[in-house]
Interface confidence: low
């Protein structure tokens, strides 16, 4: 056993190079100095070690750095990153965006693994907020990243970072997440003129309140049906037929195809039928003419 773990004569590694791929696992363990490995980590990625050999190299680094790897090593882990467990990664202190990019590159083209999720969590917590550069990087690798965060986590996104968000980054966000992001977007884009503002804010409108939708209806924005269908039902219900007509512009005709789906269905149920008839779309289900409409929410507030 003692002989097996001793490095055979002439096999001591002087540098990390291709010759090591011919070493058996026990030879790698015995003949590669962990400190040498740490200083030459940048060479490992371009040498196609087998997975078993990578296990040995990881073990050597774990022994050298039981409290967690230094960033100088982490940045050059390359494929070895895929061997790390979330528990390993929780020991790291990653502060450089370059290090984050290098490790995300290894996982590029794949869904977010538990390792990557832990790495990002460590990185963002270390920075204290999701700054624009970090968000830029993360959404470039994972377009759905933003929507994977809880509303609480999203609250740490500064409004300035919203400039890094692309429409596709919000595709899988639910209303609770958009509720948090919308006010930040409104703040971020507040100095833009009407049409430019609408282009930027459009993807976030799933979090917009009624008063903001009313304001938009006065600006000839021509909202498309896809955006309208993502609006909060409670924000759409109070809009008048005239306001919806102005909000949608030429797209108003699309309401007919969506009349059985939320929020259109619920909105129709709240409108007078004769108001709906003015659209000329054949929308049915409004409040019949002659009925008295009571605003129960107002009544409850008064009592």
């Amino acid at each position: 056993e003692v002989e097996k773990t001793a490095c055979p004569s002439g096999k001591k590694a002087r540098e990390i190079d291709e010759s090591l791929i011919f070493y058996k696992k026990w030879e790698l363990e015995a003949c590669v100095d962990a400190a040498l490995l740490a200083t030459q980590m940048d060479r490992v990625n371009a040498i196609p070690f087998t997975y078993e050999q990578l296990d040995v190299l990881k073990h050597k680094l774990d022994e050298l750095y039981p409290q967690g790897y230094p960033e100088s090593v982490i940045q050059h882990l390359g494929y070895l990153f895929l061997k790390m467990s979330p528990e390993d990664i929780r020991k790291w202190n990653v502060t450089s965006l370059e290090t984050l990019k290098a490790l995300l590159e290894v996982n590029k083209g794949h869904e977010m693994s538990p390792q990557v999720a832990t790495l990002i969590d460590r990185f963002v917590k270390g920075r204290g907020q999701l700054d624009k550069d970090t968000l830029d990087t993360l959404t470039a690798f994972y377009p759905g990243y933003l929507c994977s965060l809880s509303p609480e986590e999203l609250s740490s996104v500064p409004p300035s970072s919203i400039w890094a968000v692309r429409p596709q980054d919000l595709d899988t966000c639910d209303p609770r997440q958009l509720d948090v992001l919308y006010p930040k977007a409104r703040l971020a884009f507040q100095n833009m003129n009407g049409s430019e503002y609408f282009v930027k804010i459009q993807s976030f409108l799933g979090g917009a309140p009624t008063e903001d939708l009313k304001a938009l209806s006065q600006q000839n924005v021509s909202m498309d049906l896809a955006t309208f269908m993502k609006l909060r039902t409670d924000a759409v219900l109070p809009l008048t037929v005239a306001e919806v007509q102005k909000l949608l512009g030429p797209h108003v005709e699309g309401l007919k195809a969506e009349e059985r789906h939320r929020p259109v269905r619920d909105w129709i149920l709240r409108q007078r039928q004769d108001d709906l008839d003015t659209l000329g779309l054949g929308l049915q289900g409004g409040i019949p003419n002659g009925y008295l409409v009571l605003d129960l929410s107002m009544q409850e507030a008064l009592s």
Epitope: D17, E18, A46, I47, P48, T50, Y51, Y79
Partner: antibody, heavy 119, light 107 residues
Framework: QVQLQQSGAEVKKPGASVKVSCKTS????????LHWVRQAPGQGLEWMGW????????NYAQKFQGRVTMTRDTSISTAYMELSRLRSDDTAVYYC????????????WGQGTLVTVSS | DIQLTQSPSSISASVGDTVSITCRAS??????LAWYQQKPGKAPNLLMY???TLEDGVPSRFSGSASGTEFTLTVNRLQPEDSATYYC?????????FGGGTKVDIK
């Protein structure tokens, strides 16, 4: 995106040599090893070896030792595979390929270069 | 060298069928096995690595499993576009080796 662009088809006489190029783009060339795989007409895939573009180090399959030379030019992000003393059974499509996830499963492939050896 | 033996060498099945291809390794190769799909005149396309991990973008009707030195690629609900030759490849040790291939034809 990652691309591997190979040189065009070659016709060679028995005993001659052929040199196939593989120009890469869309990733750091020196960061990943490049493999060469060949496929004779109607046959399966055969691994020939790899080159580490970072150092120029190589690892050839035993079958091709002494006949194959893999080199690279980092200034133009291009790898080369030269096969000498060609025989008719070297007629094949030659592919360069890059792994994508460590451990040598090959994800990114060139379009292939047909080398025909005929007298 | 690790030899990989694929069976069957060819198979003909109808759209909607389930097809299984087996790859036997001559010695232990862990789970370090990949599956490729190759269509005529094209380079191979990675379907699966680590025996059972589906490559992104590959339909979920493809699945892989491992039992000792025997690996299986299964294609559920066969589609016309699945007509191709399938290869296994081990990357446990050098030299890297491929199976002989299985040609799948749609009836």
């Amino acid at each position: 995106q990652v691309q591997l662009q190979q040189s065009g088809a070659e016709v060679k006489k028995p005993g001659a040599s052929v040199k196939v190029s593989c120009k890469t783009s869309g990733y750091p060339f020196t960061g990943y090893s490049l493999h060469w795989v060949r496929q004779a007409p109607g046959q399966g895939l055969e691994w020939m070896g790899w080159i580490n573009p970072n150092s120029g180090g190589t690892n050839y399959a035993q079958k091709f030792q002494g006949r194959v030379t893999m080199t690279r030019d980092t200034s133009i992000s291009t790898a080369y595979m030269e096969l000498s003393r060609l025989r008719s059974d070297d007629t094949a499509v030659y592919y360069c390929a890059r792994d994508h996830y460590g451990g040598n499963s090959l994800f990114y492939w060139g379009q292939g270069t047909l080398v025909t050896v005929s007298s | 060298d690790i030899q990989l033996t694929q069976s069957p060498s060819s198979i003909s099945a109808s759209v909607g069928d389930t097809v299984s291809i087996t790859c036997r390794a001559s010695q232990d190769s862990g789970t370090w096995l990949a599956w490729y799909q190759q269509k005529p005149g094209k380079a191979p396309n990675l379907l699966m690595y680590d025996a059972s991990t589906l490559e992104d973008g590959v339909p979920s009707r493809f699945s892989g499993s491992a039992s000792g030195t025997e690996f299986t690629l299964t294609v559920n609900r066969l589609q016309p576009e699945d007509s191709a030759t399938y290869y296994c490849q081990q990357y446990n040790s050098y030299p890297l080796t491929f199976g002989g291939g299985t040609k799948v034809d749609i009836k």
